[in-house]
């Protein structure tokens, strides 16, 4: 059990498009056909203005026009949903396919790829039907484009809809040494395959992937729980060989000064093929990007029953410590360190700043009010709203 | 403030090695890498490689066989080493820091001053 | 690798003048550009990072866009101190690599 773990599943709340919690300043876009097709007529299911966002160029062959909805606040968007123009049955655009690109902080954007690296999502076949589209690796972002795209010069028109909820974690990235190969009847690919941050040679940095998507690995690390994947999928894992100082060291960044009480790590312990637990967890806090690691660090020396070869979430106690940086060197006990989850228990520091501060258009970073109205006391379920259940078979 | 203060020979013999420290101060090296990059009129700039502050280290493919890129985090110097240095090494070092957080992501921000590196008998 | 081609490779401007500058990626780097300045004698200064972003305190008059594979520099109205080269790195994957250069000389 992962407490305070966040289920992906559960993860699945209109976002305030259709509802109009997402207020019309905050979608924008690149351009617009006219004001009766702006950025604020882009709302699933509405019908104002002539029914959908159009741009007003070509989306062929250059794909550089774009429908933006700033949330405001880091959120994971599990799901998105398209319609074309409808306009009471006279509008005949839509759009066949289109891409996402998305942003935490407004500077930079990241396209979104499915776990085989396919960008492209189909869209529409007609303008009035809602086309659903699970999101695997779901996105943590604040700021989503839609990029339609057209095979022939065509007018394309869009409106849309975000599902998921907010990122309570916090996590804005993790550094960690890139995953590696372990070598057993079969190859087990143990990378980060949806990190979506730097890859410079050995090290990850920048971004979010598999260790914070939700996903807790099996027992069996060569299983997974997604379908046509390769062995060692829901993992990130790296050999002992690799690091004589006996430990893998990573780094976790967050949104703004945060009192953490743990660290949930889910681990594998199927130790028969060399996978253990670590031996110890070491961590250190800072409160800013340029300032010194204060006090002693945490060291966590993980007993229990080591022979019990089930994969397990290993609670790191971290004391309330106040910090925005955190690192952790995780020691090991065997030839292998493998992880599928890593994530946080901590409270916001009353008064802290945002992590990154001054202003971005369209809005500015965090803003210190409230969360929008929509969402409970827990910021994770909007009011009154069941999540979208994606019906089987349908078009993704 | 801010800076990386480069010290090296100006002269190197050919099949020699070239050894430059990269003195930081203003920062501490948690949250970066200190990226090498050369100089040359004939080739422009080349990335050489990089340390993070966890010791990790890339290198260029085509120099691996001869760089070597170290630390000594509590003085905050990085050593670089390259090995076998031939006429066409002949170029401007530099090292150049890039930061591993997002709160502080800009690309490479701060640059040493430059170690100009002849290589000749 | 991943091959940055820069054009031109010089560029005779007056005083105001607009300069654009163009850089070709060989494969996607999403937007995880950078710009530098070099002026003679000095090391380069970071001006644009992720294509489009100014770095503290460098002037409005340089704008960076593009995404993909294809990225602009732009000085709107050129001024004396920016008699310069520039050049364009990719930062998305090892090894980074950087543009030839763009040298701007006074017409």
């Known amino acids: 059990d992962m407490k305070g773990h966040f289920d992906p599943a559960k993860c699945r709340y209109a976002l305030g498009m259709q509802d109009r919690t997402i207020p019309d300043s905050d979608i924008s876009a690149s351009s617009s056909w006219s004001d009766s097709t702006a950025a604020r007529h882009s709302r699933l299911e509405s019908s104002d203005g002539d029914g959908a966002w159009c741009p007003a160029g070509s989306v062929f062959p250059k794909e550089e026009e774009y429908l933006q909805v700033d949330l405001q606040r880091l959120h994971l968007v599990a799901l998105v949903g398209t319609q074309g123009r409808h306009a009471g049955g006279l509008g005949k655009e839509f759009s066949r396919s289109y891409r996402l690109r998305y942003s935490r902080d407004g500077r930079r954007w990241m396209g979104w790829k499915d776990r085989w690296g396919q960008e492209v999502i189909s869209g529409n076949e007609d303008p009035e039907g809602v086309v659903l589209k699970d999101l695997g690796p779901p996105m943590v972002a604040r700021l989503v484009r839609f990029y339609p795209r057209a095979d022939r010069v065509m007018s394309v028109c869009l409106r849309v809809e975000l599902y998921g909820c907010l990122w309570r974690d916090g996590l804005l990235s993790y550094t960690a040494p890139v995953g590696q190969t372990m070598y057993l009847s079969e190859a087990v690919y143990l990378n980060d395959s949806t990190y979506d941050g730097h890859t410079v040679g050995g090290l990850q940095y920048g971004g979010l992937g598999q260790l914070a998507d939700g996903v807790v690995g099996l027992d069996d690390f060569r299983k997974s729980q997604e379908l046509r994947v390769w062995p060692g999928y829901d993992y990130v894992g790296w050999s002992n060989h690799s690091f004589s100082s006996g430990y893998v060291e990573m780094e976790f960044e967050f949104d703004r000064l945060r009192a953490f009480q743990a660290m949930q790590v889910h681990c594998n312990n199927m130790h028969t093929l060399g996978a253990r637990l670590p031996g110890g967890v070491e961590c250190r806090f800072r409160r800013g990007p340029a300032m010194a690691w204060e006090g002693e660090p945490m060291r966590h020396n993980l007993g229990g029953n080591l022979g019990d070869p089930r994969a397990r979430a290993v609670s790191v106690p971290l004391g309330g410590r106040v910090a925005r940086f955190l690192q952790c060197r995780f020691l090991f006990a065997g030839p292998w360190l493998l992880f599928s989850e890593i994530s946080f228990i901590s409270d916001v520091v009353n008064n802290s700043s945002p992590a990154l501060g001054g202003t971005f258009p369209p809005a500015p970073w965090w803003p210190p009010g409230p969360p929008p109205t929509n969402f409970s006391s827990l910021e994770l379920e909007p009011r009154g709203q069941q999540p979208v259940a994606k019906a089987e078979g349908s078009p993704t | 403030q801010v800076q990386l203060k480069q010290s090296g020979p100006g002269l190197v013999q050919p099949s020699q090695s070239l050894s430059i420290t990269c003195t930081v101060s203003?920062?501490?090296?948690?949250?970066?890498?200190i990226h090498w990059v050369r100089q040359s009129p004939g080739k422009g700039l080349e990335w050489l490689g990089v340390?993070?502050?966890?010791?990790?280290?890339d290198y260029n493919a085509a120099f691996i066989s001869r760089l070597s890129i170290s630390m000594d985090s509590s003085k905050g110097q990085v050593f670089f080493k390259m090995n076998s240095l031939q006429a066409n090494d002949t170029a401007i070092y530099y090292c150049?820091?890039?930061?591993?957080?997002?709160?502080?992501?800009?690309?490479?921000?701060?640059w040493g001053q430059g170690t100009s590196v002849t290589v000749s008998s | 690798s991943i091959v940055m081609t820069q054009t031109p490779k010089f560029l005779l401007v007056s005083a105001g003048d607009r300069v654009t500058i163009t850089c070709k990626a060989s494969?996607?780097?999403?937007?995880?550009v950078a710009w530098y300045q070099q002026k003679p004698g000095q090391s380069p200064k970071l001006l644009i990072y992720?294509?489009?972003n100014r770095y503290t305190g460098v002037p409005d008059r340089f704008t960076g866009s593009g995404y993909g594979t294809d990225f602009t520099f732009t000085i709107n109205t050129v001024q004396a101190e920016d008699l310069a080269v520039y050049f364009c790195?990719?930062?998305?994957?090892?090894?980074?690599?950087f543009g030839a250069g763009t040298k701007l000389e006074l017409k």
């Open positions: 340390i993070w502050s966890g010791g990790i280290t």
């Open positions: 992720y294509a489009s």
């Open positions: 150049a820091r890039r930061s591993t957080t997002v709160v502080a992501d800009y690309a490479m921000d701060y």
């Open positions: 203003g920062f501490s090296f948690t949250g970066y890498g």
């Open positions: 790195q990719q930062d998305y994957t090892s090894p980074l690599t």
């Open positions: 494969q996607s780097v999403s937007n995880d």
